[in-house]
């Protein structure tokens, strides 16, 4: 903490301006009024203060607002935001999307810091749900944001917000997250026609059940192998050779290159070898003639 010392004669700050960069830390503490600082926070960002000087300015605001800063100050924190701890941020009540954007801008280009994570958490909890505008903003700054949320947190995303999601936003999502997002996407895009619907739903198909994949196989969608490889194993296993052939269309030839990988490998093992042979791809490992084909649903009964 900076010691309390009297402000030297003639040095009392009348406004926040560049002259303050020549003030020593103790002079800033003694000569800058916290209330003046709060009303002129927007000027701080334009002045090249040192980190030590910014520490003093933060200290003055902390003294003025021990219960947490008001949004009028938060919105203009600028680089002073980088000095805030998660504990500081937990005292805030941020409701304006503009405030959120202003602070995210400060951290732009960097990984999500604990401060930013706390800020987002406070903002979203304050709103009660992840609305479209918020999701738009967050994924613009952090494409992986959606996949950083737990399935429980994702459940608060309204289907209308799904329109804001881009394919790259789902790149790091795991199966449990896609299980939550897929039904929302299905609902959001339900009024689109076949080909347009497939374009939109494609990124979410890692959460699709077997019956939806069977339905898609009847629509000439020509799913690419990259999408097929991201499907749930339990959703792929019940598909017949004919259904997979229809689902993939001309991309069915790509199965050969993926035959050692999941879920293709598991699917191959559950098909009759005769059926696999009809694809003409040389896929091996299917069930030989004469063997009983066991359904996955028999798992409980058999074990």
């Amino acid at each position: 903490e900076v010691e309390k010392t009297a402000c030297p004669s003639g040095k009392k700050a009348r406004e926040i301006d560049e002259s303050l960069i020549f003030y020593k830390k103790w002079e800033l503490e003694a000569c800058v009024d916290a209330a003046l600082l709060a009303t002129q926070m927007d000027r701080v960002n334009a002045i090249p203060f040192t980190y030590e000087q910014l520490d003093v300015l933060k200290h003055k605001l902390d003294e003025l607002y021990p219960q947490g800063y008001p949004e009028s100050v938060i919105q203009h924190l600028g680089y002073l935001f980088l000095k805030m701890s998660p504990e500081d941020i937990r005292k805030w009540n941020v409701t304006s999307l503009e405030t959120l954007k202003a602070l995210l801008e400060v951290n732009k280009g960097h990984e999500m810091s604990p401060q930013v994570a706390t800020l987002i958490d406070r903002f979203v909890k304050g709103r009660g749900q992840l609305d479209k505008d918020t999701l738009d903003t967050l994924t613009a700054f952090y494409p992986g944001y959606l996949c950083s949320l737990s399935p429980e947190e994702l459940s608060s995303v309204p289907p209308s917000s799904i329109w804001a999601v881009r394919p790259q936003d789902l790149d790091t999502c795991d199966p449990r997250q896609l299980d939550v997002l897929y039904p929302k996407a299905r609902l959001a895009f339900q009024n689109m026609n076949g080909s347009e619907y497939f374009v939109k739903i494609q990124s979410f198909l890692g959460g699709a059940p077997t019956e939806d994949l069977k339905a898609l196989s009847q629509q000439n969608v020509s799913m690419d192998l990259a999408t097929f490889m991201k499907l749930r194993t339990d959703a792929v296993l019940p598909l017949t050779v004919a259904e997979v052939q229809k689902l993939l269309g001309p991309h069915v030839e790509g199965l050969k290159a993926e035959e050692r990988h999941r879920p293709v490998r598991d699917w191959i093992l559950r098909q009759r070898q005769d059926d696999l042979d009809t694809l003409g791809l040389g896929l091996q490992g299917g069930i030989p003639n004469g063997y009983l084909v066991l359904d996955l649903s028999m798992q409980e009964a058999l074990s």
């Epitope: 795991d174 199966p175 449990r176 490889m229 991201k230 194993t233 339990d234 296993l237 050692r260 990988h261 999941r262 490998r265 598991d266 093992l269 559950r270 490992g285 299917g286 069930i287 030989p288 063997y291 009983l292 084909v293 066991l294 359904d295 996955l296 028999m298 798992q299 058999l302 074990s303």
Partner: antibody, heavy 119, light 107 residues
Framework: QVQLQESGPGLVKPSETLSLTCTVS??????????WSWIRQPPGKGLEWIGY???????NYNPSLKSRVTISVDTSKNQFSLKLSSVTAADTAVYYC???????????WGQGTMVTVSS | DIQMTQSPSSLSASVGDRVTITCRAS??????LNWYQQKPGKAPKLLIY???SLQSGVPSRFSGSGSGTDFTLTISSLQPEDFATYYC?????????FGGGTKVEIK
């Protein structure tokens, strides 16, 4: 509940064939939901997957051991077996049999059996 | 074949600590990543499958995350019974591979 139990000789001479059997109780090797694997662990070292078999007889082996390994299944006895030929001291390890649930991982393991290769 | 690299190879921690173990695959394995716990003289035990799903009966202090090539196992508050060796394992490729293991010891 499903249990796995390994059995076989604890000592094998170099150049001979190591033979182990895993008996499944409380479940069936004929289930379409599982792969039946062998995994080994040399003393003080990490885990090495040897291979698996599916009820249909389809097998998949570790490429570094493929030329020496055979895994087979006997559905009538509810067992699956491992044969590893031309063994050397480097094959000394605890050998585990394990069930792999296709939707998860190796969810059930045998308690393991120590096999020493020595003359 | 796909190499699985675990870090650290060992760590010392106290009861109540938050512990994080990472596993990196040499190529993308989607979410086909499992975590196991092994205690001396015992068979490994499945903790987490499909990168983030908790195996039935495993305490909720264990959690997993990641997809593609980078994965994490977290123990939120280390308990005395958690001192063991932890292994990651990929099942994306037909040639299954394990990480080298991370030994969690008492500080």
């Amino acid at each position: 509940q499903v249990q796995l139990q390994e059995s076989g000789p604890g000592l094998v001479k170099p150049s001979e064939t190591l033979s182990l059997t895993c008996t499944v109780s409380g479940g069936s090797v004929s289930s379409g939901s599982y792969y039946w694997s062998w995994i080994r662990q040399p003393p003080g070292k990490g885990l090495e997957w040897i291979g698996y078999i599916y009820y249909s007889g389809s097998t998949n082996y570790n490429p570094s051991l493929k030329s020496r390994v055979t895994i087979s299944v006997d559905t009538s006895k509810n067992q699956f077996s491992l044969k590893l030929s031309s063994v050397t001291a480097a094959d000394t390890a605890v050998y585990y049999c394990a069930r792999e649930d296709v939707l998860s991982g190796f969810d059930i393991w045998g308690q393991g059996t120590m096999v020493t290769v020595s003359s | 074949d796909i190499q699985m690299t675990q870090s650290p190879s060992s760590l010392s921690a106290s009861v109540g600590d938050r512990v994080t173990i990472t596993c990196r695959a040499s190529q993308s394995i989607s979410s086909y990543l499992n975590w196991y716990q092994q205690k001396p003289g015992k068979a490994p035990k499945l903790l987490i499958y499909a990168a983030s799903s908790l195996q039935s009966g495993v305490p909720s202090r264990f959690s997993g995350s990641g997809s593609g090539t980078d994965f994490t196992l977290t123990i939120s508050s280390l308990q005395p019974e958690d001192f063991a060796t932890y292994y990651c394992q990929q099942s994306y490729d037909a040639f299954y591979t394990f990480g080298g293991g991370t030994k969690v010891e008492i500080k």
